[in-house]
């Protein structure tokens, strides 16, 4: 999902050149210090160079910009605003650059930005207006089509006194700027829940990756608005069962493929509807691999091989008959 480059010939800028030209305006298409540039591939790579800020002298031709493996810490408003603007910049990869704060309007003045990867940054402070650029109730539409936010959860001791899920969702929903978003990756973020309003406001989503989180239930999540969703990745969560409402919604999405591997499915009486659905549906990828985790007597049983007699719930004893 991250921007890739087919560049074969990159010109490097030696560090000593930077100071030599810093007093005068940058040349239009020079290559920033500590970066590699290929005008033919429209690609600039400033990778693993411990940069503490975004280079100011990025060439106007840049279409793919890699700023991975740096020490950026903060992305301020207008971090990529240039005169003339970086009008061609379509793919921006900032993964693994130790960002802990992304401020409002950080990506403003990038009219062609379609792919943004902020993965593997401990984002303790993601402004609600990081992607929308303004606090208007309806912002100008963002050009973003793909937003990759895998493993952006900060260590617990660095989190603000608020829900991390809520912070991320606020940024996704602000100003309805991301109505055109087609791919959203939120894997490996310790999400315990998915706020119920988030999906309703991202109607163009085709691919949603929520894998490797801690989702226990989808009861309050609605997929109905995601009319053209093609992939829903829910692998490696803490899901126990999918209930009828969710099953019906997924079955009603004609283009969806659902990925459910490695969840601790509880094979009791509440699982009966899901087992019936799994036997009939074509939408679940690798459904024959899904196995029970609980109760102990059912561990490793294949869901598709279960029948109603296997799926029982221990009767709940009335309080007078319970022993301590």
């Amino acid at each position: 999902s991250s921007p890739t480059s087919s560049a074969s010939s990159f010109s490097s800028s030696a560090p000593f050149l930077a100071s030599a030209v810093s007093a005068q305006p940058p040349l239009p298409d020079q290559c920033p210090a500590l970066c590699e540039c290929s005008e033919a591939a429209r690609t600039v790579k400033c990778v693993n160079r411990n940069l503490t800020e975004v280079p100011t002298d990025l060439p106007a031709y840049v279409r793919n910009l890699f700023l991975t493996g740096n020490q950026l810490a903060v992305l301020p408003a207008g971090a990529f605003a240039r005169r003339p603007p970086l009008a061609e910049l379509a793919a921006l990869n900032l993964s693994g650059s130790r960002l802990d704060e992304v401020r409002a309007g950080a990506f403003e003045h990038l009219p062609s930005l379609r792919q943004l990867d902020l993965s593997h940054n401990p984002l303790a402070d993601l402004s609600p207006f990081a992607f929308s650029g303004s606090n208007a109730s309806v912002s100008a539409p963002s050009p973003l089509v793909e937003l990759i936010l895998n493993h952006i959860v900060p260590p617990e001791d660095e989190r603000q006194n608020r829900s991390f899920e809520g912070m991320v969702v606020a940024a996704l929903l602000a100003g309805r700027a991301l109505q055109g978003l087609r791919r959203l990756e939120l894997a490996s973020n310790h999400f315990l829940y998915l706020p119920r309003d988030v999906l309703a406001q991202l109607p163009s989503l085709r691919h949603l990756d929520l894998s490797n989180n801690s989702l226990v239930s989808l009861t309050y999540v609605s997929f109905r608005n995601l009319t053209h969703l093609e992939s829903l990745h829910l692998e490696d969560n803490a899901l126990k069962v999918l209930h009828n409402g969710t099953l019906a919604e997924l079955q009603g999405l004609p283009h969806i493929r659902v990925f459910l591997d490695n969840n601790p499915w509880v094979c009791d009486c509440h699982m009966a509807d899901m087992v019936t659905w799994l036997k009939e549906t074509e939408v679940v990828q690798g459904k024959d691999r899904l196995t029970c985790a609980y109760p102990e007597k059912m561990r490793n049983r294949v869901l598709l091989e279960l029948n109603s007699a296997d799926l029982d719930c221990d009767p709940i004893l009335p309080p007078s008959l319970q022993t301590s």
């Epitope: 793909e146 691919h207 009319t227 053209h228 093609e230 283009h255 493929r257």
Partner: antibody
Framework: EVQLVQSGAEVKKPGATVKISCKVS????????MNWVQQAPGKGLEWIGR????????NYNGKFKGRVTITADTSTDTAYMELSSLRSEDTAVYFC????????WGQGTLVTVSS | DIQMTQSPSSLSASVGDRVTITCRAS??????LNWYQQKPGKAPKLLIY???RLHSGVPSRFSGSGSGTDFTFTISSLQPEDIATYYC?????????FGGGTKLEIK
């Protein structure tokens, strides 16, 4: 922008098999679904089937089932449609179309079945 | 299979006219109805998906409405470049099926 480039025209004898390719570029924003559609000369459009390129899952139109095989090679971003036991009524232009709602189409491949 | 019935099969109109094409499904398809434009010798192009959503880059003179079984496609002000055949298609229930097409000509 997603672009689909199909292989060239084919002339086949009745009973033969044809395999058409469709290469996707602009892949970052393309769909996982690749559809195939038939258009006989002067006629309308008929959906043949589709493949989910990431895992190879397919759906076919019953009218073509048993004679058609759709495959995909993710390493080359190419999808294929193979139609066997060809007959004269299979003479048509075959299109690949990317997306759930068939957002982008290839230029078409004319297959002529004639003895 | 769901049958899609398009009408009229051909239509003649003048530049600037408002043009309407209808499509009827043999059973409920919710809003999973797409409209395509095909010019002679060319591949079809998606104009509208999910009944009324405009595909990227499609002029706003094209619009769609309806739900369930009855759908309408409208060109608010016909332009010379709109001369083509238009197809509706449902993608609610496999196999996907197309209408028979409407050939649009200039008077």
């Amino acid at each position: 922008e997603v672009q689909l480039v199909q292989s060239g025209a084919e002339v086949k004898k009745p009973g033969a098999t044809v395999k058409i390719s469709c290469k996707v570029s602009g892949y970052a924003f393309s769909s996982s679904w690749m559809n195939w559609v038939q258009q006989a000369p002067g006629k309308g459009l008929e959906w043949i089937g589709r493949i989910y390129r990431e895992d190879g899952h397919t759906n076919y139109n019953g009218k073509f089932k048993g004679r058609v095989t759709i495959t995909a090679d993710t390493s080359t971003d190419t999808a294929y449609m193979e139609l066997s036991s060809l007959r004269s009524e299979d003479t048509a232009v075959y299109f690949c179309a990317n997306g759930g709602a068939m957002d982008y189409w290839g230029q078409g491949t004319l297959v002529t079945v004639s003895s | 299979d769901i049958q899609m019935t398009q009408s009229p099969s051909s239509l003649s109109a003048s530049v600037g006219d408002r043009v309407t094409i209808t499509c009827r499904a043999s059973q409920d398809i919710s809003n999973y109805l797409n409209w395509y434009q095909q010019k002679p010798g060319k591949a079809p192009k998606l104009l509208i998906y999910y009944t009324s959503r405009l595909h990227s880059g499609v002029p706003s003179r094209f619009s769609g409405s309806g739900s369930g079984t009855d759908f309408t496609f409208t060109i608010s002000s016909l332009q010379p470049e709109d001369i083509a055949t238009y197809y509706c298609q449902q993608d609610n229930t496999l196999p996907w099926t197309f209408g028979g097409g409407t050939k649009l000509e200039i008077k």
